[in-house]
Interface confidence: medium
């Protein structure tokens, strides 16, 4: 699809290309799974065009068909962790509020691994926000290149 | 400055307990995962346990897995070694140590340790 | 448990001269997580190298790590009379966390 000439003068936020890359900042206390992004130019090479962050988590200001990714690499680990530490640790992607449209969009299991990654295809409206839940008892890398978390608008 | 300063190390008899603490200052003491690493007189190093800056995820080698309990209290900026049923081989200078910013286990400070006998 | 085997067990050199340091893993390590860490007698380790090449603040060009998988070495370039210690190496990509058993850097 063209662009119209007066399309070609507006900020890709208005055209609805909302885009997003965090790194990791740090993880929950205690009783709390969560992950906890950030994202800016002075952190390297993560940042935020359109979706905006709160406490952490990842907020959608456009309505639109997303493509969600995610990698998370621990730091901690071992190829027999799962057993060693009793509880098998698992990464889950979902909306977390509003509590109306709370789901979950990914969950994988490390098992014997150290890595995991997925991505999937989404809506996710105004409003959505997004939270990252690692459970169990090992670590997560804050390393840039081991871990990160984005989303990018495709389509209405 | 990053500070460790470790203590509660002496002599004790097979079977009994001791508890060590690590005094930290000069960071942000919650924000950093712990260990214990120990070194019997002329022997190697020995990663010992691991904490992570909330104290919500701990580790253990095997040799003292079941016997020994890390812990931390970020209020105080302390951590702790709670050592039960001790043996013999547990003999050594227990030294704190603090990890890096990433969560990765290496150990980028430590303290200059707290000796642990352990005798009849 | 990966078991690092550090050679040679002393290393007889005088000042000035070129040091290598060997640490051998039992199985790949991960990501390279490998670090290198130096003991002088009645003191604690202080770090050295880390992610087996990276030098840590305040360390020395004249300290440099490198080597992939199983194989690591610690290069001293030209030994200074403070750099005579027991050095080091330890993997942190895989639980336990293991040390090598060391190698004395003593003066001929």
């Known amino acids: 699809q063209r662009l119209s000439r007066a399309q070609q003068q507006l900020p890709l936020e208005s055209l609805g290309w909302d885009i997003a890359e965090l790194q990791l900042n740090h993880t929950g206390p205690q009783q709390d799974p969560r992950l906890y992004w950030q994202g800016g130019p002075a952190l390297g090479r993560s940042f935020l065009r359109g979706p905006e962050l709160d406490k952490g988590q990842l907020r959608i200001r456009r309505d639109g068909i997303y493509m969600v990714h995610i990698q998370v690499t621990l730091a901690i680990c071992s190829s027999t962790s799962t057993s060693r530490h009793h509880h098998p640790t698992t990464l889950a992607v979902g909306i977390c509020s509003p509590a109306s449209r709370s789901i979950s969009l990914l969950r994988l299991s490390f098992h014997q691994g150290c890595t995991i990654a997925s991505q999937r295809l989404t809506p996710l409206a105004r409003g959505d926000t997004l939270c990252t839940n690692l459970t169990g008892t090992l670590l997560p890398s804050r390393n840039t290149d081991e871990t990160f978390f984005g989303v990018q608008w495709v389509r209405p | 400055e990053v500070q460790l300063l470790e203590s509660g190390g002496g002599m004790v008899q097979p079977g009994g307990s001791l508890r060590l603490s690590c005094a930290a200052s000069?960071?942000?003491?919650?924000?950093?995962?712990m260990s214990w690493v120990r070194q019997a007189p002329g022997k190697c190093l020995e990663w010992v346990s691991a904490?992570?800056?909330?104290?919500?995820?701990?580790f253990y080698a095997e040799s003292v897995e079941g016997r020994f309990t890390i812990s931390r209290d970020n209020s105080k900026n302390t951590l702790y070694l709670q050592m039960n049923s001790l043996r013999a081989e547990d003999t050594a200078v227990y030294y704190c140590?603090?990890?890096?910013?990433?969560?990765?286990?290496?150990?980028?400070?430590w303290g200059q340790g707290t000796l642990v006998t352990v005798s009849s | 448990e990966i078991v690092l085997t550090q050679s040679p067990g002393t290393l007889s050199l005088s000042p000035g001269e070129r040091a290598t340091l060997s640490c051998r893993a039992s199985?790949?390590?991960?990501?390279?997580?490998l670090a290198w860490y130096q003991q002088k007698p009645g003191q604690a380790p202080r770090l050295l190298i880390y992610g087996a090449s990276s030098r840590a603040t305040g360390i020395p060009d004249r300290f440099s790590g490198s080597g992939s998988g199983t194989d690591f070495t610690l290069t001293i370039s030209r030994l200074e009379p403070e750099d005579f210690a027991v050095y080091y190496c330890q993997q942190y990509g895989d639980l336990p966390f293991t040390f090598g058993c060391g190698t004395k850097v003593e003066i001929k």
């Open positions: 199985q790949s390590v991960r990501s390279n997580y």
């Open positions: 000069g960071f942000t003491f919650s924000s950093y995962a």
């Open positions: 140590a603090k990890h890096d910013y990433s969560n990765y286990p290496y150990f980028d400070y």
């Open positions: 904490i992570s800056g909330s104290g919500g995820r701990t």
